[in-house]
């Protein structure tokens, strides 16, 4: 039993589960939104799809003091293979194009649902 005990220990979360949890978090944010999300802060829009998780994190990491998206930021960091810090600017972003955080989160939710349906979990 001691040897078998290892099988019960929590291992890495499967990508499909992590994506589903991220989608659920974004659903919570969009459904529970009363006042303007993050005081109407603006973030960079994203124009491409490869490397999207890192680009999304790069956009949202620049929003500080917004507890509503802190969990989303943490979850996105799990999908991004490199360290992301505020001020980074990816080629994936549409330069000079910013949108409201609420719209970004809503759009991200739409996109992640598509990826989930298509079986693209990473």
């Amino acid at each position: 039993l001691t040897c078998l005990g290892g099988f019960a220990s929590p291992g890495p979360v499967p990508p499909s589960t992590a994506l589903r949890e991220l989608i659920e978090e974004l659903v919570n944010i969009t459904q529970n939104q009363k006042a303007p999300l993050c005081n109407g802060s603006m973030v960079w829009s994203i124009n491409l799809t490869a490397g999207m998780y890192c680009a999304a994190l790069e956009s949202l990491i620049n929003v500080s003091g917004c507890s509503a998206i802190e969990k989303t930021q943490r979850m996105l960091s799990g999908f991004c293979p490199h360290k992301v810090s505020a001020g980074q600017f990816s080629s994936l972003h549409v330069r000079d194009t910013k949108i409201e955080v609420a719209q970004f989160v809503k759009d991200l939710l739409l996109h992640l649902k598509k990826l989930f349906r298509e079986g693209q979990f990473n």
Epitope: N47, L48, T49, I99, E100, K106, D107, L108, L110, H111
Partner: nanobody, 118 residues
Framework: GVQLLESGGGLVQPGGSLRLSCAAS????????MGWVRQAPGKGLEWVSS????????YYADSVKGRFTISRDNSKNTLYLQMNSLRAEDTAVYYC???????????WGQGTLVTVSS
């Protein structure tokens, strides 16, 4: 907020060509399926064409198949409709719109008028 701004409409002779553009702003254009819808004078809305978010899948109404080509440039947040071999029956206001099944993701432009007449 969200904006879709069509341009490129105008008067053209039968058999001529036009290229419509739709500049998107205020939302994550690259993640949306997009489309074109038209409304002829005194008629209802008619779906013309749509394209998936990747740009790899395109769909056309039978009435425009082989004459119209939809495309997109996600780096420019722009949707296009190349219209060739235009006919009088293509005369309409052409609207750019998102093409999503999900409720709450429905955005439309103001439209651009295309008139095909000699």
């Amino acid at each position: 907020g969200v904006q879709l701004l069509e341009s490129g409409g105008g008067l053209v002779q039968p058999g001529g060509s036009l290229r419509l553009s739709c500049a998107a702003s205020g939302f994550s254009f690259a993640w949306y399926d997009m489309g074109w819808v038209r409304q002829a004078p005194g008629k209802g809305l008619e779906w013309v064409s749509s394209i998936d978010w990747k740009g790899g899948k395109t769909y056309y109404a039978d009435s425009v198949k082989g004459r119209f080509t939809i495309s997109r440039d996600n780096s420019k947040n722009t949707l296009y409709l190349q219209m060739n071999s235009l006919r009088a029956e293509d005369t309409a206001v052409y609207y750019c719109a998102t093409a999503e099944d999900e409720p709450g993701y429905d955005y439309w432009g103001q439209g651009t008028l295309v008139t095909v007449s000699s």
